[in-house]
Every structure is written in structure tokens, then in C-alpha cells.
């Protein structure tokens, strides 16, 4: 297992909708095949597997069971989305990369992205 | 909902190895979610670990992350908790539990809506 290094923002702040994008960006030492990207959210003295891809370079990302990302790639950057996220959701997301094939493997983890969700204030009641 | 009854608990010393199954009965187990939880005595039941409804997901509490691997078989109907190098903290009731949700980004709060009996682990030095 060989370290590469990821990058990713520090802070996003999820829009209005509950929906948070970020960059996850890996220095690819080689020319791989098949990359593997998983986010992980660490909070509430947990680690949860929020979601998991895994693709062809120049393919669309495929996301494992009951996702809640989506995604797109483009050369060495994985374009990450989070969708139904709320306030209780807030936390440091991490994008860990591995370089599946061909050999060697490859792993990086990136520091995190700290998202923060705001939950949409109700409307108020109107006669109108 | 779906009919849980765990196994495997035990009297082990500690750095010592338990595996505890979860059998399945009822309803289509690949449409909940699994999750395993523990009681100690006089303290409240927490997390320990969750894995969604493929298997292809799981979540830890940081506390056994690195020692507890959780799995399922879900041609078996069953779920499974690896417990390695095991703590005198790790004393308690072991619970598992099923949710009819997906997954998500904190399944600690799902609604398990189902329960097993428990299975008593023991961890002495």
C-alpha cells in the first residue's frame, strides 16, 4: 500500500436545499484504471461511510446501495454532491481515494471538509 | 417488522475474540438497515456499529473502530459482529437491531424499530 496525497476544501456551506458539493482531488502517481472514492463523516464520536464509488477513468461515477451522493469525475478530481443533508448532518466529510488498478495500490486520505447545514427557516403563515 | 435473536456472547479475557450473530427472521431482511448496540450496567445503551442494506456501508463508534468489524449475509438472513482485542470496557449487553431506512449519514439515529433479546459479552482480566 503506497500513500498519495488528497485534496479537498475545508469549509462548504450546504445550500438552502440541504445540498453540499465539494472537489476531492488526488495526486495520481500513475496512470490508474480504476479509482475507488469514499466519504466518510466523522462526528458525534462516529465514522460512517456515507457513501462509496467506484469507476473507470473517463466513466461515470457508480455509487454503492442507497446513496445519497452523486458525482462526476474529471481526470485526477472527483466532483462530489451531498443531497438531504440538515443542521444534525453538520460534520468533517473526508474524501478517501484509492487507486484499485492496475498495481500497486495506491491510498489517500484527505483532511476533511467541515460542512455546516442550515436548516431553512419555516415561512411564515400569510393570508395572502 | 422483522424477528431478531442474537448469539455468540460470552466470558472472554481481555485482548480476547467474540464473534456475535444476529439471525433473522420475517420480513425481506436486505430492506433494513443492521446495526448493533450495547448496554453496559447502570449506563445507557449506545452505538456500536451499522452496516446498510447491502453491506457495502458501514459506520463505527470511534470507541471499537479498529477492533469491530461488522457484516451481513443476506442470502442467510443474518448479521454479524467481529469483535476483536476486546476491553474490559467493552463489558456489556450486546443488542441488534433493524431499521426499515437507507442508508444515511448518521445511522446511530435511525429508527430500529426491531430488537433482538441481547447477548451478555464479559470481558475480565
Known amino acids: 500500500c503506497k500513500a498519495m496525497h488528497v485534496a479537498q476544501p475545508a469549509v462548504v456551506l450546504a445550500s438552502s436545499r440541504g445540498i453540499a458539493s465539494f472537489v476531492c482531488e488526488y495526486a495520481s502517481p500513475g496512470k490508474a484504471t480504476e479509482v475507488r472514492v469514499t466519504v466518510l463523516r466523522q462526528a458525534d464520536s462516529q465514522v460512517t461511510e456515507v457513501c462509496a464509488a467506484t469507476y473507470m477513468m473517463g466513466n461515470e461515477l457508480t455509487f454503492l446501495d442507497d446513496s445519497i451522493c452523486t458525482g462526476t469525475s474529471s481526470g485526477n478530481q472527483v466532483n462530489l454532491t451531498i443531497q438531504g443533508l440538515r443542521a444534525m448532518d453538520t460534520g468533517l466529510y473526508i474524501c478517501k481515494v484509492e487507486l484499485m488498478y492496475p498495481p500497486p495500490y495506491y491510498l489517500g486520505i484527505g483532511n476533511g471538509t467541515q460542512i455546516y447545514v442550515i436548516d431553512p427557516e419555516p415561512c411564515p403563515d400569510s393570508d395572502f | 417488522e422483522v424477528q431478531l435473536v442474537e448469539s455468540g456472547g460470552g466470558l472472554v479475557q481481555t485482548g480476547g475474540s467474540l464473534r456475535l450473530s444476529c439471525a433473522a427472521s420475517?420480513?425481506?431482511?436486505?430492506?433494513?438497515?443492521m446495526g448493533w448496540f450495547r448496554q453496559a450496567p447502570g449506563k445507557d445503551r449506545e452505538f456500536v456499529a451499522a452496516?446498510?442494506?447491502?453491506?457495502?456501508?458501514?459506520s463505527y463508534a470511534d470507541s471499537v473502530k479498529g477492533r469491530f468489524t461488522i457484516s451481513r449475509d443476506n442470502a442467510k438472513k443474518m448479521a454479524y459482529l467481529q469483535m476483536n482485542s476486546l476491553k474490559l470496557e467493552d463489558t456489556a449487553v450486546y443488542y441488534c437491531?433493524?431499521?426499515?431506512?437507507?442508508?444515511?449519514?448518521?445511522?446511530?439515529?435511525?429508527?430500529?424499530?426491531?430488537w433482538g433479546q441481547g447477548t451478555q459479552v464479559t470481558v475480565s482480566s
Open positions: 437491531a433493524a431499521a426499515p431506512v437507507p442508508w444515511g449519514t448518521r445511522p446511530s439515529t435511525f429508527p430500529y424499530d426491531s
Open positions: 420475517g420480513r425481506t431482511f436486505s430492506n433494513y438497515t
Open positions: 452496516i446498510s442494506r447491502s453491506g457495502g456501508l458501514k
